[in-house]
């Protein structure tokens, strides 16, 4: 990796846990998004692989509420509204960073956690395994 | 209100920026995900709304690499491989938290940032606006 020169204006971290523990400014900066972005609109209803959104809530985590997508069908919805089981609805997953208080109940000490969330669904051609 | 005793096991934050600046442990805990999860497999190729993954790299950000989905077509791919322009390929977007070095180049000082990323694409029925 590239060695970053120690900037004299940087906070000092001669902590025994450094560099595992860093200082983080919690005043969130919004990049490329308005304060109140429209979240993927109504795609969950209009998609050929529609999904439902389920609330995953944990008050000890930030964000406390995460909406998880669950595909409605095994197959994909055709133009006539029927489900085509020759195709598959599958979840698109992404790893996201969340904050968790650690030690618990400490007001100003946190740990980053990575969780895998389903964001929506897409329609794919199935992988067919031929038996010899 | 009930006074919460300051937990002796909590880090001390007599920092002039406290309490906007807090300590965060970067030794990331993976919850419900392996260290190297398969990223939504090869769905980007097999989807009826296929997408390309573009590498968005920024050494001042954590994670420094984020993969952005760009839908390949305006329409959706039919079983015969042709594109159906009566349907739309659209990106599924999600807001995620990242850490940005602040001040720049400081190895142990960050700011929380919210960015909007495209995770994949899904095929939707278009909204048709009828002109009176």
């Amino acid at each position: 990796g590239i060695a970053i020169p120690r900037n004299s204006g940087c906070p000092n971290s001669e902590d025994k846990n450094f560099p595992r523990t860093v200082m983080v400014n919690l005043n969130i900066h919004n990049r490329n998004t308005s304060t109140n972005p429209k979240r993927s609109s109504d795609y969950y209803n209009r998609s050929t692989s529609p999904w439902n959104l389920h609330r995953n809530e944990d008050p000890e985590r930030y964000p406390s509420v995460i909406w998880e997508a669950k595909c409605r069908h095994l197959g994909c919805v055709k133009a006539d509204g029927n489900v085509d089981y020759h195709m598959n609805s599958v979840p698109i997953q992404q790893e996201i960073l969340v904050l968790r208080r650690e030690p618990r109940h400490c007001p100003n000490s946190f740990r980053l956690e990575k969780i895998l969330v389903s964001v929506g669904c897409t329609c794919v051609t199935p992988i067919v395994h031929h038996v010899a | 209100g009930i006074a919460i005793p300051r937990n002796s096991g909590c880090p001390n934050s007599e920092d002039k920026n406290f309490p906007r600046t807090v300590m965060v442990n970067l030794n990331i805990h993976n919850r419900n995900t392996s260290t190297n999860p398969k990223r939504s497999s090869d769905y980007y190729n097999r989807s009826t709304s296929p997408w390309n993954l573009h590498r968005n790299e920024d050494p001042e950000r954590y994670p420094s690499v984020i993969w952005e989905a760009k839908c390949r077509h305006l329409g959706c791919v039919k079983a015969d491989g042709n594109v159906d322009y009566h349907m739309n390929s659209v990106p599924i977007q999600q807001e995620i938290l990242v850490l940005r070095r602040e001040p720049r180049h400081c190895p142990n000082s960050f700011r929380l940032e919210k960015i909007l990323v495209s995770v994949g694409c899904t095929c939707v029925t278009p909204i048709v606006h009828h002109v009176a």
Partner: antibody, heavy 124, light 109 residues
Framework: QVQLQQSGPGLVKPSQTLSLTCAIS??????????WGWIRQSPGRGLEWLGR?????????DYAVSVKSRITINPDTSKNQFSLQLNSVTPEDTAVYYC??????????????WGQGTLVTVSS | DIVLTQSPATLSLSPGERATLSCRAS???????LAWYQQKPGQAPRLLIY???NRATGVPARFSGSGSGTDFTLTISSLEPEDFATYYC??????????FGQGTKVEIK
Amino acid sequence: QVQLQQSGPGLVKPSQTLSLTCAISGDSVSSSSAAWGWIRQSPGRGLEWLGRISYRSKWYNDYAVSVKSRITINPDTSKNQFSLQLNSVTPEDTAVYYCAREVDSLYYSYFDIWGQGTLVTVSS
Amino acid sequence: DIVLTQSPATLSLSPGERATLSCRASQNVWAFYLAWYQQKPGQAPRLLIYGASNRATGVPARFSGSGSGTDFTLTISSLEPEDFATYYCTQYYSSPSLTFGQGTKVEIK
């Protein structure tokens, strides 16, 4: 811009049902980035959150524990409005009732738009 | 439920003075979900600060918020005549818990 217009009776008899409506303009009750709530204010109780509805592929309801057994908040998508029903009211339910839009972007939660308020008196 | 306790109940100050309002939670809350509102007699509350420290659209720079954990502060750097009102803090912890403080009235001395 977004506006909320409240309507409903200002006087309700004890044991009856309090019904208020909040009409939305400039946004949709089915918005996936907002929740729609009711808050009341009385001299004795101060500001008290009563409940909210939000749409995320289906309707979600959250109600304050203090009124959970008596409250219903319903959307009306055809009229782009939502309503509050509070059953079995008593004089303690006398208050100014506000409807409000709650920005619900995962990362923040706050009421940015409020209705004008409706004073509801419970009295025989 | 989490209890939010605001202090002082009343703050008597003159225009131009600095006002410091406190909001204390009965247990740790996420600063991101803490907001401050201003209310004048006969009016609905108006959003001032969200996420503990972010000014809402159109709110003058003399208003600032800070805090984390259990202790939060709203500061008005130099009081203007239109700032004399009642201020409320509120927090969202988890469904169905959304609570308001009892308010701090800022009155002209």
